[in-house]
């Protein structure tokens, strides 16, 4: 159904005669005021802007020559003012001016609060002419209006290169309050205090809110939009919503969820990622937070071994990424791993433990008592050495690492020499003559090289010098190894 | 006090242009249309066209379209007017005026007038 | 285009008379009409504005009457300073014609 909105203006008079005081109003005819009950001092808005307005010592004169009869006034005719309707109902309201017949090319347009109405919209604009004048009705149709149809239409004409402006005509489109602001979840501490907020509008105003706790309501007297509930605090899940009652009947707001923060829950899923001799990557699935955000958390460790004292080792980390590197670890070591994360409340349980163990590591000591001698032929360095005393940590000796490093004349050259676990010598052919030999070895497991021993020097003479003295490492404590030629 | 402050006098060549200003001061510059309006040396007056400060619009009388050009700085509350290919018969004294309406009615007049830009084309 | 038509083109006459200038045009313009006043070497000035309406500051010696096609402006007891020329213009329609003008001169 549509609503016809129209008020229509009354036959415009004659000059009716002056207005008290020396302002008018450029859209209030001046010719005739109809639908007002005397006549009243009014503001004259400038021709090019309404809204601004200029003063004019202006005098209506009361009688016109007889060409002047048929003139309206340059003004729309006034309409409804006001429009009030339920929502999903149509509308139809327009405006109308007559105009000279000289101003032939006048257009009509429609505007809503400020901003020109282009396009889809239902507006017709009907032309009646007359042998002097063409009376313009331009009608603007809304099916099915919403809210956000409510608004300020006006209609503006342009003559002469001026804007004539219609009044408003105010659109109230009444329908159920609408939430502008609804109950947010939250997650609370125990019994402490919040508050839960709720705002609606109509129109119609006013619009009246109750508060719901688990389907109950909370307020025996409605308050007015918009509404604040202090709740004093909690010691369990409570859902809350808001009810908003106007003339047009009820909306009832989301349910929102208020949580009790409590301790997480332990992690789970703790996995082993990677081990190397002296440290392990682990990652955690995070267990339920809570209701309140993690903060950190901790990996404790334990070493499985019937002679260890059963010490707990702590690492604090972040709580995410969900991953953590354990290092300064034993090789070759057993150990029980556990994680617990902490939100605002506490710390969780542990995680169940899990199993994980080192690698075997490099050997940490070198091998012992390095000699070296030049053969009678003159063409080999015999190397001799004793095997380290290597924890079990390190891991099955695989061999050995011989580093040689050749000098003379400012030239230096490095050779390495790998040689079987099973060995306490080796020999190296002579690179170099009238020069300085450099002899290093170190132990090698599995997990790695160890380090090298002291560096022990041979001077290799030139042909035609004898000298088969050897070299060797000192005994431990002494700080220079020593050249025995 | 309503004033409309135009430019000084302009001597140019044929085939030349000339822009040519009216500061408006004492009121809402935007409020009211800005016509234009020439005057040859002894002779009547005639009107060039106006302008709407408020968004630029222009209407030209037909003789004039090509001839003249209207624009304003709202910022400046000046309008002015381009003349260009100018001749000897573009010699005169050029008016700019204040458009009013008188109430609802169809009735302009021009309340205020400029103090007049002589523009002289001689070669 | 709406021609409008001044008469007399000039007029010679002593101070303290009565006259009367006529405009008439060509086609009905109501009473879209204004007179203006313009002395020698100056900017016109407004006298009569919608036909009869005498615009601020305009002695009431001087009077607008008419409407239609046929104009008028009577000025009263001339004064020395009432001399120099007027026009009238109308304001129908898109484009604004004025009449030829009317000089005004001490006989």
């Known amino acids: 159904a549509i609503t016809e909105a129209r008020e229509e203006a009354k036959p415009y008079p004659l000059f009716p005669g002056p207005l008290p005081g020396s302002l008018q109003t450029d859209h209030t005819s001046l010719l005739s005021l109809p639908h007002t009950s005397g006549y009243q001092p009014a503001l004259m808005f400038s021709p090019t802007q309404p809204g601004r307005p200029y003063t004019g010592n202006v005098a209506i004169p009361r009688v016109t020559s007889a060409g002047s009869k048929l003139l309206p006034p340059l003004a729309f005719k006034h309409t409804v003012g006001h429009i009030i309707l339920s929502e999903h109902k149509d509308v139809k309201f327009n405006c109308s001016i007559s105009v000279p017949n000289i101003y032939q090319d006048t257009t009509i347009s429609w505007w809503k609060d400020g901003k020109e109405l282009l396009g889809a919209h239902h507006a017709i604009t009907q032309f009646y002419p007359d042998d002097e004048v063409t009376a313009i009705i331009a009608s603007f149709s809304i099916t099915s209006v919403q809210r956000s149809d409510n608004g300020s239409y006006i209609c503006k004409m342009k003559i002469n290169n001026e804007e004539i402006v219609s009044d408003p005509i105010y659109i109230e489109v009444q329908g159920l309050p609408h939430f502008t602001k609804q109950p947010e979840s939250m997650n609370v501490t125990r019994n402490t205090a919040f508050n839960l907020t709720c705002q609606a509008v109509g129109p119609p105003e006013p619009v009246n809110i109750f508060w719901v706790q688990n389907s109950s309501r909370v307020n025996e007297q409605p308050e007015k939009s918009p509404s604040v509930l202090t709740v004093p605090g909690l010691t369990e899940m409570a859902v809350f919503s808001c009810e908003a009652h106007n003339d047009k009947g009820l909306t009832v707001s989301k349910g929102v969820q208020i949580n009790i923060k409590a301790i997480p829950s332990p992690p789970t899923e703790v996995s082993i990622h990677n081990s190397t001799a002296h440290s392990i990557l682990i990652s955690w699935v995070p267990g339920f937070d809570g209701y309140s955000p993690f903060r950190n958390c901790s990996v404790q460790v334990k070493e499985v071994d019937p002679l260890s004292n059963g010490s707990v080792m702590i690492f604090n980390t972040s709580a995410s990424p969900h991953m953590y590197q354990i290092k300064q670890l034993q090789a070759l070591a057993n150990y029980s791993i556990g994680v617990s994360c902490m939100n605002e409340i506490g710390w969780s349980a542990v995680s169940p433990w899990i199993l994980a163990s080192t690698t075997e590591g490099a050997p940490s000591v070198a091998p012992l008592n390095v000699t070296v001698f030049l053969n009678e032929s003159r063409d080999n360095v015999d190397i001799r050495w004793m095997k380290p005393l290597t924890k079990r940590q390190a891991g099955e000796l695989v061999g050995y690492r011989i580093s040689h490093v050749w000098q003379s004349a400012g030239i230096s050259k490095e050779l390495l020499e790998e040689v079987g676990q099973n060995n306490s010598r080796a020999q190296i052919s002579v690179q170099v003559h009238n020069a300085t030999c450099t002899v290093r070895i170190a132990a090698v497991t599995k997990g790695g090289v160890g380090p090298f021993s002291d560096p022990v020097k041979i001077f290799i003479p030139a042909h035609g010098w004898v000298d088969h003295a050897p070299s060797s490492t000192p005994a431990p404590g002494n700080a220079d190894p020593v050249l025995i030629i | 006090e309503v004033q409309l402050q135009q430019s000084g006098p302009e001597l140019v060549k044929p085939g030349a242009s000339v822009k040519i200003f009216c500061k408006a001061s004492g009121y809402t510059f935007t409020a009211y249309n800005m016509d234009w309006v020439k005057q040859s040396h002894g002779k009547s007056l005639e009107w060039i066209g106006d302008?709407?400060?408020?968004?630029?619009?222009?209407i030209y009388n037909q003789k004039f379209k090509g001839k003249a050009t209207l624009t304003v700085d709202k910022s400046s509350s000046t309008a002015y007017m381009e003349l260009r290919s100018l001749t000897s018969e573009d010699t005169a004294v050029y008016y700019c005026?204040?458009?009013?309406?008188?109430?609802?009615?169809?009735?302009?007049?021009?309340?205020?007038w400029g103090t007049g830009t002589t523009v002289t084309v001689s070669s | 285009d709406i021609q409008m038509t001044q008469s007399p083109a000039s007029l010679s006459v002593s101070v303290g008379e009565t006259v009367t200038i006529t405009c008439r045009a060509s086609e009905n313009i109501y009473s879209s009409l204004a007179w203006y006043q313009q002395k020698q070497g100056k900017s016109p000035q407004l006298l009569v504005y919608?036909?009869?309406n005498l615009a601020d500051g305009v002695p009431s010696r001087f009077s607008g009457s008419g409407s239609g096609t046929q104009f008028y402006l009577k000025i009263n007891g001339l004064q020395s300073e009432d001399f120099g020329s007027y026009y009238c213009q109308h304001f129908w329609g898109t484009s604004y014609t004025f009449g030829g003008g009317t000089k005004l001169e001490i006989k």
């Open positions: 302008i709407n400060p408020n968004n630029g619009g222009t």
């Open positions: 919608a036909a009869t």
């Open positions: 005026a204040r458009r009013r309406r008188y109430g609802n009615t169809y009735y302009w007049y021009f309340d205020v």
